[in-house]
């Protein structure tokens, strides 16, 4: 299991530090959830061959996963601290229908599913304390949710393997974008 | 075993130019993110620069934008910090370090970094 954000890695010649700014926390948050992630891959790889399904292939889904686009502001041309940190805690809250789904998909990496679930809830109020403009966030709707993972569940082993490991790659994608982001805040 | 070793530190006037070196050995460049950091006399340890191998994604601290370019050869694992216009405030002891992270996202932070060199030498002064 990757380190829990705030123990320290094998450093060489590292540096002692100060205790982390806000801005550091929530980098390291996300890094924690992508190391969980990237455990999670490896099983997800292991059991089936959706790693090795091509992109085009992987795209005719209906999922509404969040992904980043230029009007969200997050990338290096047009970036707007204000209206990506909007973008990012909206997806961020988009994605926990789709990490509650991946609950129950996991045999040997179960604990990390968990672990990947609850630290997105941490990293979101973390980056709601740093957002000014609140109002400007739409949570999803809980009925809505519900329904979805209702039909997400209800579908074969084959298109549910293919929904995980969606959710992952997507997942995945998101956090990488947020953290190049975040660096320019 | 992981060795980051840097090189191509020195005495330069102000406005000059210097190339730093960092030679990985113990693994392979291919899938992380390489930073270079600075650390003054008294100060905390800054990131510079950034480069990952993934998607080339690169990273510049404000104060060097314009001046410094990174860059990465896989083929002989090496890493170099060209650092041109430099200022007395660029002195620093500069370090690289490694995050071997699979997902290779720059960081200005020193807390993902699993591995540093020892440092080498900048001093800008006339």
């Known amino acids: 299991a990757p380190v829990p954000p705030g123990e320290d890695s094998k450093d060489v010649a590292a540096p002692h530090r100060q205790p982390l700014t806000s801005s550091e926390r929530i980098d390291k948050q996300i890094r924690y959830i992508l190391d969980g992630i990237s455990a999670l891959r490896k099983e997800t790889c292991n059991k089936s061959n959706m790693c090795e399904s091509s992109k085009e292939a992987l795209a005719e889904n209906n999922l509404n996963l969040p992904k980043m686009a230029e009007k969200d502001g997050c990338f290096q041309s047009g970036f707007n601290e204000e209206t990506c940190l909007v973008k990012i805690i909206t997806g961020l809250l988009e994605f926990e229908v789709y990490l509650e789904y991946l609950q129950n998909r996991f045999e040997s990496s179960e604990e990390q599913a968990r672990a990947v679930q609850m630290s997105t809830k941490v990293l979101i109020q973390f980056l709601q304390k740093k957002a000014k403009n609140l109002d400007a966030i739409t949570t999803p709707d809980p009925t809505t949710n519900a329904s979805l993972l209702t039909k997400l569940q209800a579908q074969n082993q084959w298109l549910q393997d293919m929904t995980t490991h969606l959710i992952l790659r997507s997942f995945k994608e998101f956090l990488q974008s947020s953290l190049r982001a975040l660096r320019q805040m | 075993q992981v060795q980051l070793v840097e090189s191509g530190g020195g005495l330069v006037q102000p406005g000059g130019s210097l190339r730093l070196s960092c030679a990985a050995s113990g693994f392979t460049l291919d899938d992380s993110a390489i930073g270079w950091f600075r650390q003054a006399p008294g100060k905390e340890r800054e990131g510079v620069s950034c480069i990952s191998s993934s998607d080339g994604d690169t990273y510049y601290d404000d104060s060097v934008k314009g001046r410094f370019t990174i860059s990465r050869d896989n083929v002989k694992n090496m890493v170099y910090l060209q650092m041109n216009s430099l200022k007395p405030e660029d002195t620093a002891v500069y370090f690289c370090?490694?995050?071997?992270?699979?997902?290779?996202?720059?960081?200005?932070?020193?807390?993902?970094?699993?591995?540093w060199g020892q440092g080498t030498q900048v001093t800008v002064s006339s």
């Open positions: 370090a490694i995050d071997l992270s699979d997902y290779g996202v720059c960081s200005k932070w020193p807390s993902p970094y699993d591995y």
